[in-house]
């Protein structure tokens, strides 16, 4: 019979329940915002905001300074005091809505939910490798802010995203805020605005450009700003908003808004719908054409990509790509398919689609009925007309007004549904060597570090570990500090190495040494670790072979047995070709001669499972004793593979040498035509891999084999006669003299 090694699931080579402890900081309240600073003189800091407090941490996450940011009206509020004697507004807690660095100065800017959403500028004072905050500047000039026109009212209690850009000698704040009717009526924050920080840090210059949801839509049309970033000549905001001003407001989709980073103008404000789908390789019956839509963006991050992913996305290495985690709806619960999907949108492609959309709107011939869109911000109009106007006047340009691009940008899940039930709540993408890694936080407080590739049917994990014991969701915003990422979960900030927290979750030497170079994993005799964990025995160049099973478990003391060994690190080459003299198998004292691979039996093994097979012919030595013994595989002088060479010995117990004994045969006669069912009784009749019952030298076809009994059908006889009957096990005759008599039919 053709025995095959059982497959070992790929997951068996790793253990994601391994506990990793990473540095952390307890902030004393739910973390509301976090940002990092790295100076050019080796000084660095982590700024962590909770309700009514701003913490300054050193690079080791130890507290350096703490500043009271509220409650407003409380004499202990240190930021409030910077605005001079109050009262400045209704008293109340300060929830930090904005925490950003002004890179030009550099300085930290914080804006809260109290005091009309005003901001504070905190000068950074390097002190060795740490940073302190100087006394805050109140970015609010009382005399030029009114409820209906307030350049210094920045943060909305419903959420605000800010990206700071240096233009010329000034810092411009690109601000996007979620509004409703109540918020809009109170000191008039705007949906999207570009505000210049005045040189004297007394606030923002009046007369700034802005777009706001029109009053009639404020009740039903809410825009959530999920992420903002600056790359190249543009600032981008990512939003989740109703797909239509007129239809069901709960039908949401995701948009990208693009603003010029070189001109503080909103005439070239553009929006583009981002469409992310899960398109399984085999489509279920009833599944939508083009894949299942995942319209709601949960988190996003943009980063330059490594060579491999760049090739898959048909872009150049190092090009900026926007990555987004999408879900099916606000609650995140899917019907069928994974909970979260990840789509990749190359920035250059986004820009091209936007520019083509502008051409379609503004270059003749314009498709009739093509709408300018953004009816929640501006009066409806058809291209190429400006908002609210029937036609272009000679001194206006179609291009100088905001526009929703008429086509969407559609992509499919990079992970092909493999995130399954995981609910991703945080995302940061890095390029390590030529590998692009997604660092993801989850709803249940885990960190997943996974290579971003689209061509596989399994996930390539750098790590998958729990941040702590609380199991609280990892928050959306992630910051980088040197070679670490900072994730927040509950009231804690965690510092996770970009290279992964360690290597102990890789259980086998092969998996360990196949890990990415940047992880710094090596084998320490019986575990995978980084060099600092086991400096004495740590090595990265070889793995011993690993025997996990063999077949059969017994063989005849006389005669050969075809032994199949199962395990890993036998070959390192898919072909399984073994150079002469590299593999030595012994069973007890007896050698087992390697057999060439039977190419007809080679079967592709998906990387999700792995198993290696090795076959050899066991011919026991004359000195070999009956009884249990070990199987030993030694590999030496193997040419190195891509990741390591195989070198070493693996021993497995449980093989027994046995002597088959034939005790009885019946019946001892039968028709000359053959077909008599012979029963051979004895002991150890099933040992080894081959046996044959010979009647007058012709094989008696075996029907059943067991340890104590063989059944076979006799072949036809040439003549009526008594003929010799023998049993061979492993090609060697079992002692005993038996005859079978052919009779007339």
């Amino acid at each position: 019979e053709d025995w095959q090694c059982p497959r070992t699931p790929y997951a068996a080579s790793r253990d994601f329940d391994v506990k990793y402890v990473v540095p952390s900081f307890s902030a004393g309240g739910l973390v509301q915002a976090m940002v990092t600073y790295e100076g050019d003189r080796n000084e660095s800091a982590v700024f962590v905001a909770i309700r009514n407090r701003l913490h300054v941490l050193g690079p080791d996450l130890k507290s350096v300074q703490s500043l009271a940011t509220g409650p407003a009206g409380d004499p202990g509020c240190q930021t409030c005091a910077a605005c001079g004697p109050g009262p400045h507004g209704p008293p109340g807690d300060t929830d930090t809505k904005v925490l950003v660095l002004d890179p030009a100065l550099p300085a930290l800017v914080s804006c809260g939910s109290s005091l009309q959403g005003r901001c504070f500028l905190h000068d950074l004072e390097p002190q060795g490798t740490a940073v302190h905050l100087a006394a805050p500047a109140c970015l609010f000039s009382a005399h030029h802010n009114r409820p209906d026109d307030c350049p210094d009212c920045v943060a909305s209690p419903l959420g605000t995203r800010v990206t700071v850009v240096e233009q010329g000698q000034a810092s411009y704040f690109y601000v996007a805020s979620s509004l409703d009717a109540a918020v809009a009526a109170s000191f008039s924050p705007r949906s999207v605005s570009i505000r210049r920080l005045k040189a004297d840090a007394s606030g923002f210059a009046p007369g700034f450009v802005a777009l706001s949801v029109l009053p009639k839509h404020l009740v039903s049309y809410s825009i959530e700003y999920v992420h903002s970033f600056h790359t190249g000549a543009f600032v981008y905001f990512l939003t989740v908003q109703p797909a239509s001003v007129t239809d069901d407001p709960s039908a949401l989709h995701t948009r990208l808004a693009r603003l010029s980073a070189t001109e503080p103008e909103l005439g070239d404000y553009r929006e583009l719908v981002l469409d992310c789908r899960f398109a399984p390789k085999r489509r279920r019956r009833g599944a939508p054409e083009g894949g299942q839509p995942y319209p709601v963006l949960r988190v996003a991050h943009s980063a330059p990509v490594g060579a491999q992913l760049a090739t898959e996305l048909s872009i150049a290495e190092g090009q900026e790509v926007l990555f987004g985690v999408f879900v099916t709806g606000k609650d995140g619960g899917p019907g069928v398919g994974p909970n979260s999907v990840v789509c990749a949108f190359p920035i250059d492609l986004l820009d091209t689609l936007i520019d083509e959309g502008v051409e379609r709107c503004c270059e003749s011939p314009v498709h009739p009925g093509l709408r300018r869109g953004l009816d929640f911000f501006q009066s409806p109009s058809f291209c190429p007309n400006p908002p609210g106007l029937e036609a272009l006047s000679p001194n206006t340009s179609c291009r100088h007004f905001p526009l929703l691009v008429s086509s969407s940008f559609s992509r499919v899940d990079l992970f092909n549904g493999l995130l399954g039930p995981v609910q991703v709540t945080a995302l940061y993408v890095t390029r390590l060597d030529n590998v692009t890694v997604a660092h993801m936080g989850t709803m249940d407080g885990r960190i997943l570090q996974v290579e971003l590739v689209r061509s596989l049917n399994y996930l390539l994990y750098v790590s998958n570990f729990s941040l702590g014991d609380s199991g609280q969701p990892v928050q959306r915003d992630v910051s980088r500090l040197g070679d670490h990422l900072l994730f927040a979960s509950g009231d804690q900030v965690f510092q996770v190495p970009i290279q992964g927290p360690g290597c102990r979750h890789f259980l086998t030497c092969g998996r360990c040494l196949r890990a990415w170079h940047f992880m710094g994993c090596g084998w320490c005799g019986n575990m995978c670790g980084q060099q600092k964990e086991c400096p004495g025995s740590w090595q990265q160049d070889h793995c011993p072979p690993k025997l996990t099973e063999f077949h059969p478990h017994s063989g005849p003391l006389r005669g050969s047995t075809r032994l199949t060994l199962c395990g890993s690190n036998f070959y390192l080459h898919p072909s399984g070709l073994v150079p002469e003299g590299t593999h030595q198998v012994t069973v007890g004292q007896s050698p087992c001669r390697p057999l060439p691979k039977d190419s007809s039996k080679l079967r592709p093994v998906p990387r999700k499972d792995f198993v290696e097979e090795f076959e050899c012919e066991l011919e026991p030595l004359g000195t070999q004793a009956v009884g249990p013994t070990n199987v030993s595989l030694t590999v030496t002088n193997m040419p190195p593979g891509k990741h390591f060479r195989v070198d070493g010995t693996s021993v497995l117990r449980g093989f027994s040498f046995m002597e088959p004994v034939l005790i009885a045969v019946q019946p001892l006669f039968g028709p000359r035509a053959g077909g008599t069912c012979l029963t051979l009784e004895g002991q150890s009749l099933s040992v080894g891999t081959s046996r044959a019952v010979l009647v007058n030298g012709t094989e008696c076809l075996l029907a059943r084999v067991s340890e104590g009994q063989l059944l076979c059908a006799t072949p036809p006889g040439a003549t009526v006669a008594s003929v010799p009957l023998s049993l061979q096990v492993g090609g060697a005759q079992v002692p005993g003299s038996w005859t079978f008599q052919y009779r007339e039919d």
Epitope: L105, A137, C138, A199
Partner: antibody
């Protein structure tokens, strides 16, 4: 007591270079933004250059951009102005001035007594 | 760049007089304006910042007002030590710029 003492002025030929220094004392120099302001003989004040407390941001008047470089050494409590490709119109008394910390507003709350730079052949 | 235009360029007045100096910005600077006093051979001294806030130790006869583009410095009752040149400076955006100065002379 806050003190700012400029030095390094003098006579220089057109096209030449000069480096002005401003030694600060009586306050934590690294906490403050600093600037240079000049005054040509018998003329008004002209703002020249600004440097942020950390030295991260520098700004120049158009008239000196590309020729002058402002810098600071916080460990030595000193502000510098490197002046290259000097012209006759750069002749002036150069004042070093301290700006209040961010938290107040950018107005010069302390000035040095000035150092005279004369550019002439 | 923001141009600052000061007027008059000079004014003759007597002790006890009320003197008003105007400063106009070429574009809106809200209240980002400072006033300085300079005596011959001396460094300038800060009088007013943020258009109307007194610097420490400045006598109350000096006051500043105005916003956006129009600003004034008023000396309510001129004293002998007030004869000097006065400069305005905008602090709204870089490059920071000064007005041309107003010389207050003894009549």
């Amino acid at each position: 007591e806050v003190q700012l003492l400029e030095s390094g002025g003098g006579l220089v030929q057109p096209g030449g270079s000069l480096r002005l220094s401003c030694a600060a004392s009586g306050f934590t120099f690294s906490d403050y933004q600093m600037e240079w302001v000049r005054q040509a003989p018998g003329k008004g004040l002209e703002w020249v250059s600004y440097i942020y407390s950390s030295g991260g941001k520098t700004v120049y008047a158009d008239s000196v951009k590309g020729r002058f470089t402002i810098s600071r050494d916080n460990s030595k409590n000193t502000l510098y102005l490197q002046m290259n490709s000097l012209r006759a119109e750069d002749t002036a008394v150069y004042y070093c001035a301290r700006l209040p910390r961010v938290g107040a507003t950018i107005i010069n709350d302390y000035w040095g007594q000035g150092t005279l730079v004369t550019v002439s052949s | 760049d923001i141009q600052m235009t000061q007027s008059p360029s000079s004014v003759s007045a007597s002790v006890g007089d009320r003197v008003t100096i105007t400063c106009r910005a070429s574009r809106g600077i809200s209240s980002s304006l400072a006033w300085y006093q300079q005596k011959p051979g001396r460094a300038p001294k800060l009088l007013i910042y943020a258009a109307s806030s007194f610097h420490t130790g400045v006598p109350s006869r000096f006051s500043g007002s105005g916003s956006v583009t129009e600003f004034t410095l008023t000396i309510s009752s001129l004293q002998p030590e007030d004869f000097a040149t006065y400069y305005c400076q905008q602090t709204d955006s870089f490059p920071l710029t000064f007005g041309g100065g107003t010389k207050v002379e003894i009549k």
